[in-house]
């Protein structure tokens, strides 16, 4: 099938980085500046992505691959292929419509992005608070109060702090 296709369609011989130029008897012409074709047999080249303003160039466009952007410092990428840049905040803050705002009491954010999440409720696991939470850190749960009673034979080591899941962006 491939052989018959290439006999019928001269465009299928055009490699990546070129396009099949209908204006020139379907010969393979190189992609013009600031354009690319990542696969063979293309009838047009795609315009290169421009990384400007809030975006900066991570990888230059070539005749066979699109440019790749990331975000300027102080911002982070969102979406496939860094389709958006979103402002960073400090740990202990979350991004709102009014910019970065401190986490409310009882919540924390240990990253520069995402939302403030509630502290772990140690008592739900029958544990006590070993280290209080802050805006930047979750509480650390320790042994249950029963484990700390004088009759207890040994003290169980404190449980590690819960690894918070990433909030959906």
């Amino acid at each position: 099938f491939e052989r018959t296709r290439s006999l019928q369609d001269p465009c299928s011989n055009c490699p990546a980085g070129t396009f099949c130029d209908n204006n020139r008897n379907q010969i393979c012409s190189p992609c013009p500046p600031n354009s690319f074709s990542s696969a063979g047999g293309q009838r047009t080249c795609d315009i290169c992505r421009q990384c400007k303003g809030v975006f900066r160039t991570r990888k230059e466009c070539s005749s066979t691959s699109n440019a790749e952007c990331d975000c300027t410092p102080g911002f982070h990428c969102l979406g496939a292929g860094c389709s958006m840049c979103e402002q960073d905040c400090k740990q202990g803050q979350e991004l709102t419509k009014k910019g970065c705002k401190d986490c409310c009491f009882g919540t924390f954010n240990d990253q520069k992005r995402g939302i403030c999440r509630p502290w772990t409720n140690c008592s739900l696991d029958g544990k006590s608070v070993l280290v209080n939470g802050t805006k930047e850190r979750d509480v650390v749960c320790g042994p249950s109060p029963a484990d700390l009673s004088p009759g207890a034979s040994s003290v169980t080591p404190p449980a590690p702090a819960r690894e918070p899941g990433h909030s959906p962006q």
């Epitope: 303003g53 809030v54 911002f75 969102l78 979406g79 389709s83 958006m84 840049c85 979103e86 402002q87 991004l95 709102t96 419509k97 962006q169």
Partner: nanobody, 123 residues
Framework: EVQLVESGGGLVQIGGSLRLSCAAS?????KYWMIWVRQAPEKGLEW???????????YYVDSVEGRFTISRDNANNSLFLQMNSLRAEDTAVYYC????????????????SGQGTRVTVSS
């Protein structure tokens, strides 16, 4: 092609005023939040203000609140930033950027921005 083109920058005295404009094309302007960000010399990019689709919600970074006003004209696909009582620390390149629509992964994110217009505030 989606395009944003800023204009209106220039040299102004401390305490003076400027009005920046941003002409949008290639997309349905009225469906998107719009944002102004700025980059001062030797500093990172800073969010300045944003405005929702119909102009009923406007938000500002604390340092410009009460001095700058963001507005939009959906009929003419234009975004504006009126800057009053300008200070030396407002010197920067100002970029207009497209924010999210109702279906975006983030209302706060930006997916297109212009080339910027330079504002210099001097004594």
């Amino acid at each position: 092609e989606v395009q944003l083109v800023e204009s209106g920058g220039g040299l102004v005295q401390i305490g003076g005023s400027l009005r920046l404009s941003c002409a949008a094309s290639g997309f349905t302007f009225s469906k998107y939040w719009m944002i102004w960000v700025r980059q001062a010399p030797e500093k990172g990019l800073e969010w300045v203000a944003n405005i929702n689709q119909d102009g009923s919600e406007k938000y500002y970074v604390d340092s410009v609140e009460g001095r700058f006003t963001i507005s939009r004209d959906n009929a003419n696909n234009s975004l504006f930033l009126q800057m009053n009582s300008l200070r030396a620390e407002d010197t920067a390149v100002y970029y207009c950027a497209r924010g999210g629509d109702d279906y975006s992964i983030s209302h706060f994110g930006m997916d297109v921005s212009g080339q910027g217009t330079r504002v210099t505030v001097s004594s």
